[in-house]
C-alpha cells in the first residue's frame, strides 16, 4: 500500500516554505485544490484553494498563500512566504470532488518555524531575500465552506505505526527526520 | 552508497517503443523523486518529466505526452520510463535522475544514472 | 516556457586562471537555479544549487550568485580536471529547463 508520509520542514521566521503536492493528472487536473491546516482535534481549515475549474499554472494569491497548479504535470505547488511562528502546524494538500469528500494528496507537511535566522550570505538558513514578486494577475478564489467530518478530526497519532484511513489503501506512517530546505525564497 | 543503475543500449526502429529501466539503491526509495532527462548525441539536456515513486503519480514535458508512460516497482525499487512512437530524433542518451524529497519543490537533481543510449534507426 | 540562455558557448583558458559563466533567465526565477558539471561520457554532476549553496563534496573553487534573471558560475582558479561542459537549470516554473552548455577547455 501506498505511504501517507508526513515530512517535516523546520524554517526560520520570514523565510517560505515552498512544496508541491502531486495527484493523478487524468483523474483531477482541472478539479479544485486546496491547502488546510489540521489543528489537534479540530476539523482541517482550508486556508487557500485554486479556482474552480482549477486553471493551468494560474497563481493564486491569499495572504501569504501562493498556490499555482501545474495541471499538465499532475502537481499543486504551494508557496507559504513570509512565515510566522504562529504558522507552525500540520498542513495537507486536499482536492474538493463535491458531492464525493475531499481527496486527500501526499504528503502532509509538518512546519515548524523558529525566531530569528543565521543570517550569513548563501547560508541555506538565509531570510534576507525572501521576496517573492507575484504576477499581478493573481486572484483570490473563493473555497467550498465545508470540510468532510471523515477527514482527519484529530491530529495524528504519535506513534510509528501504520494507521489506515477510512476507505483507502493509504497509511499514514510518521517520518521524524528534519527537511532542512535548500534556499526556499 | 547512493546510486540509479540504468539497463543497457538500446537499437530499436521508428514506431517501435522502448523501455528503460532505474534501479534505485543506497536511500528511501519512496521518498524521492525520480526524473528523466535525455540528451541528444552532442546536444544539451531536455528534461522529460518526473515521477513520485511513493504515490505512483507522474508527469511530462508537452511534447512527450501521450507518448511516455512512467512506471514503478516498490518491491525492487526499480522506475521504468516507456517511449512509444519512436522516431529517429528520439536518439538519445536517456538519463533517470533523484531529485529533492517528493513533497519539496526543490528540483535539483543530486544523483543520476549512467545514461542508456537508445537508437532509432530503420 | 522560461528559456536559458547560457555564455559564452565554449571558452578556453589556462590551469589556475577565474572562470566566469553567466546564465540568464527569460523571466525572474528568484534564485531557483542549479549549476551541473557534465564531463565527456558521463552523467552530470550537481555543483550549486539555489544559485549558490555548494552542494556536499564539491570543491570550494567552484561558487554561484545572482538572483531574478541574471546568474553567475566561477571557476576561482581552474584546474585540469575542470574540463567539462557546465549547465544551468532553472526550476522556478515548470516545464523545468537547462541553458545550452559552456563547454570549458584548458588553453
Known amino acids: 500500500a501506498t505511504k501517507l508520509t508526513e515530512e517535516k520542514y523546520e524554517l526560520k521566521e520570514g523565510q517560505t516554505l515552498d512544496v508541491k503536492c502531486d495527484y493523478t493528472l487524468e483523474k483531477f487536473a482541472s478539479s479544485q485544490k486546496a491547502w488546510q491546516i489540521i489543528r489537534d482535534g479540530e476539523m482541517p481549515k482550508t486556508l487557500a484553494c485554486t479556482e474552480r475549474p482549477s486553471k493551468n499554472s494560474h497563481p493564486v494569491q491569499v495572504g501569504r498563500i501562493i498556490l499555482e497548479d501545474y495541471h499538465d504535470h499532475g502537481l499543486l505547488r504551494v508557496r507559504m512566504v513570509n512565515l510566522q511562528v504562529e504558522d507552525s502546524g500540520l498542513y495537507q494538500c486536499v482536492i474538493y470532488q463535491p458531492p464525493k469528500e475531499p481527496h486527500m494528496l501526499f504528503d502532509r507537511i509538518r512546519l515548524v518555524v523558529t525566531k530569528g535566522f543565521s543570517g550569513t550570505p548563501g547560508s541555506n538558513e538565509n531570510s534576507t531575500q525572501n521576496v517573492y514578486k507575484i504576477p499581478p494577475t493573481t486572484t483570490k478564489a473563493l473555497c467550498p465552506l465545508y470540510t468532510s467530518p471523515r477527514t482527519v478530526t484529530q491530529a495524528p497519532p504519535k506513534s510509528t505505526a501504520d494507521v489506515s484511513t477510512p476507505d483507502s489503501e493509504i497509511n499514514l506512517t510518521n517520518v521524524t527526520d528534519i527537511i532542512r530546505v535548500p534556499v526556499f525564497n | 552508497q547512493v546510486q540509479l543503475v540504468q539497463s543497457g543500449a538500446e537499437v530499436t526502429k521508428p514506431g517501435a517503443s522502448v523501455k528503460v529501466s532505474c534501479k534505485a539503491s543506497g536511500y528511501t526509495f519512496t521518498r524521492y523523486d525520480i526524473n528523466w532527462v535525455r540528451q541528444a548525441t552532442g546536444q544539451g539536456l531536455e528534461w522529460m518529466g518526473w515521477?513520485?515513486?511513493?504515490?505512483?503519480?507522474?508527469g511530462s514535458v508537452q511534447k512527450f505526452r501521450g507518448r511516455v508512460t512512467m512506471t514503478r516497482d516498490t518491491s525492487i525499487t526499480t522506475v521504468y520510463m516507456e517511449l512509444s512512437s519512436l522516431r529517429s530524433d528520439d536518439t538519445a542518451v536517456y538519463y533517470c535522475a533523484r531529485g529533492g524529497i517528493s513533497s519539496s519543490w526543490h528540483w535539483a537533481f543530486d544523483i543520476w544514472g549512467q545514461g542508456t543510449m537508445v537508437t532509432v534507426s530503420s | 516556457d522560461i528559456q536559458m540562455t547560457q555564455s559564452p558557448s565554449s571558452l578556453s583558458a589556462s590551469v589556475g586562471d577565474r572562470v566566469t559563466i553567466t546564465c540568464q533567465a527569460s523571466?525572474?526565477?528568484?534564485?531557483?537555479l542549479n549549476w551541473y558539471q557534465q564531463k565527456p561520457g558521463k552523467a552530470p554532476k550537481l555543483l550549486i544549487y539555489g544559485a549558490y549553496t555548494l552542494e556536499t563534496g564539491v570543491p570550494s573553487r567552484f561558487s554561484g550568485s545572482g538572483s531574478g534573471t541574471d546568474f553567475t558560475f566561477t571557476i576561482s582558479s581552474l584546474q585540469p580536471e575542470d574540463i567539462a561542459t557546465y549547465y544551468c537549470q532553472q526550476y522556478d516554473k515548470l516545464p523545468l529547463t537547462f541553458g545550452g552548455g559552456t563547454k570549458v577547455e584548458i588553453k
Open positions: 523571466q525572474d526565477i528568484n534564485n531557483h
Open positions: 515521477m513520485n515513486p511513493n504515490s505512483g503519480n507522474s
